[in-house]
């Protein structure tokens, strides 16, 4: 058993049929010595008396809010949560496996630049009695500070018969050094509590590996005289690290109709302009990627050809 | 050229060669990006490699103030990785293809280090750790880790030279 936060404790249980469970001793936080009784949740049934209560925790029915009283007055609470371990593996029932970029990916994180700011998100089908708390650091043995905000519900989607909820959190490294080569990864830890079930999820990454620039901005077209060619120009996204002579991007420019199966024109460039062939009913799209490190491409920025 | 005396390097040549190094580092093992090597406990390897750190003056302001600190750090790293790529880790079994990008990568690391420090001038170099994996699978894992780490190192070096070529070239 360990303390998650004040008066909230996590009991780690091996979860299999007829498992013996864990013996837990609860102590009432009071100077009082006698006349103390214990109850669980809303029940008035007295579970025991005395300053300590010894219980055998085997299942979710044994978890919950234990309260010690004296003469009708509440002295203190202890909330017991369960953390299940099945076949040596901690349960992951609360969050959905996003399967990208690999199986057992519950947390996904992205950064728009090298400033040390990043966003992580996760998915669940649970809509109520759900809380998250997020901690992060750079490195684990001698951790350096990363400050995370509160996790918030950022999107709701309907998937077949199910509703899916996306939560996200923003974090900022306290003393970020955008130009340095990271040697220690960022660690992100998410505590998830659903009713009386506790789970924790972790992710470890370098900012450089989760970079995904915003799409290029201000796409403009200039038709070239006596030609089907068009000069397309764009700018670096506002959110990208500066100066751009140091933090450079490379770009992919594509002309395509509405369907992916349609014919297209495509060219890669380090410049912020390119000449392409425009067709009626087609769109010109541009996306960006770090020039020197193969992290994710941005989403496309598009303008119609006509 | 970035000689210990403090004259300027051939920024544009360094830029071209460092960008080539980036391409080669990813070509040498593009799939490295799909392996989560941190799960393999890499303290003994990648903790020993020289990293370009915050105080090394490789940020735009540091380069403007005095690029020598940064260039010396990059030079150290280039020599370190050049030695690693020439070591038993890469020359032993399972043997690499004669024409794999690792060969070009090795040569280009040497080429860039020579651009930064012509013969006859000496900067301190870091000792290369004695990493002698006994099993081919260990060697393979070590290669992945070294290349992964090299990808990060040459990305910073390429930014430094691109910025230098754009803003510090005479």
């Amino acid at each position: 058993i360990w303390e998650l936060k004040k008066d909230v404790y996590v009991v780690e249980l091996d979860w299999y049929p007829d498992a013996p469970g864990e013996m837990v001793v609860l102590t009432c936080d009071t100077p009082e010595e006698d006349g103390i009784t214990w109850t669980l949740d809303q029940s008035s049934e007295v579970l025991g008396s005395g300053k300590t209560l010894t219980i055998q925790v085997k299942e979710f029915g044994d978890a919950g809010q234990y309260t010690c009283h004296k003469g009708g007055e509440v002295l203190s609470h202890s909330l017991l949560l369960l953390h299940k371990k099945e076949d040596g593996i901690w349960s992951t029932d609360i969050l959905k496996d996003q399967k990208e970029p690999k199986n057992k990916t519950f947390l996904r994180c992205e950064a728009k630049n090298y400033s040390g700011r990043f966003t992580c998100w996760w998915l669940t089908t649970i809509s109520t009695d759900l809380t998250f708390s997020v901690k992060s650091s750079r490195g684990s043995s001698d951790p350096q500070g990363v400050t995370c905000g509160a996790a918030t519900l950022s999107a709701e989607r309907v998937r077949g018969d199910n509703k899916e909820y996306e939560y996200s959190v923003e974090c900022q490294e306290d003393s970020a050094c955008p130009a340095a080569e990271e040697s220690l990864p960022i660690e992100v830890m998410v505590d998830a509590v659903h009713k009386l079930k506790y789970e924790n999820y972790t992710s470890s990454f370098f900012i450089r590996d989760i970079i995904k620039p915003d799409p290029p901005k201000n796409l403009q077209l200039k038709p070239l005289k006596n030609s089907r060619q068009v000069e397309v120009s764009w700018e670096y996204p506002d959110t990208w690290s500066t100066p751009h002579s140091y933090f450079s991007l490379t770009f992919c420019v594509q002309v395509q109709g509405k369907s992916k199966r349609e014919k297209k024109d495509r060219v890669f460039t380090d410049k912020t302009s390119a000449t392409v062939i425009c067709r009626k009913n087609a769109s010109i799209s541009v996306r960006a990627q770090d020039r020197y490190y193969s992290s994710s491409w941005s989403e496309w920025a598009s303008v119609p050809c006509s | 050229r970035a000689v210990p005396g403090g004259s300027s390097p051939a920024w544009t040549q360094c830029q071209q060669l460092s960008q080539k190094l980036c391409t080669l580092a990813w070509s040498a093992h593009p799939l490295v990006g799909h392996m989560d090597l941190r799960e393999e406990g890499d303290e003994e390897t990648t903790n020993d490699v020289p990293h370009i750190q915050c105080g090394d003056g490789c940020d735009p302001q540091g380069l403007r103030d005095n690029s020598q600190f940064c260039l010396q750090r990059i030079h150290q790293g280039l020599i370190f990785y050049e030695k690693l790529l020439g070591s038993d880790i890469f020359t032993g079994e399972p043997s690499l293809l004669p024409d794999s990008p690792v060969g070009q990568l090795h040569a280009s690391l040497l080429g860039l280090s020579q651009l930064l420090q012509p013969e006859g001038h000496h900067w301190e170099t870091q000792q290369i750790p004695s990493l002698s994996p006994s099993q081919p699978w260990q060697r393979l894992l070590l290669r992945f880790k070294i290349l992964r780490s090299l990808q990060a190192f040459v990305a910073v070096a390429a930014r430094v030279f691109a910025h230098g070529a754009a803003t510090l070239s005479p």
Partner: antibody
Amino acid sequence: EVQLQQSGADLVRSGASIKLSCTASGFNIKDYYMHWVKQRPEQGLEWIGWIDPENGDTEYAPKFQGKATMTADTSSNTAYLQLSSLTSEDTAVYYCNATKELRYFDVWGAGTTVTVSS
Amino acid sequence: DIVLTQSPATLSVTPGDSVSLSCRASQSISINLHWYQQKSHESPRLLIKFASQSISGIPSRFSGYGSGTDFTLSINSVETEDFGRYFCQQSNSWPLTFGAGTKLELK
């Protein structure tokens, strides 16, 4: 199966013109760009130009402007290359090519050998 | 026009050898470079697009890398069916241009 059938070899007199054909099967040429590429004996490849059969748009390499004319007939699923004022320099194999992506050459015809005699 | 220089002009190899063919552009072309194989009396066929992207149906022994001005086509363990000419082609700007080719022949 995507295939391109090119017209047979031709021997033509210097100064004359010739029209080569390239008929597609297994796909509709409207959905592709059609290119023509020249290869002289024991030489490299030279790009002549492309046509978008959907709208008749064309783009020529400067070297072939005035020498080559590309057309396409979507009803017969055929692309054509006309070469005018032929000289011995035009003796070559001419390949037609169909591609979904404009700037590289995906599906090649077997080529038509054109020999210009004086 | 962008000029592509291929080297060597001829490469004599034994089946089982691994080889690298080089293509150098007269100016930076990012990764807008493609590789073709042409066997004797046949049409060319696309091997690699955009410097390193593989083409379905092409054996995995063919790989490409490079960006900017220097590009390489590697053939890991040459097979007898690989003999012929190899061309690079740039698509960075019009007109599209090809290299003069490298002839891969039996030693």
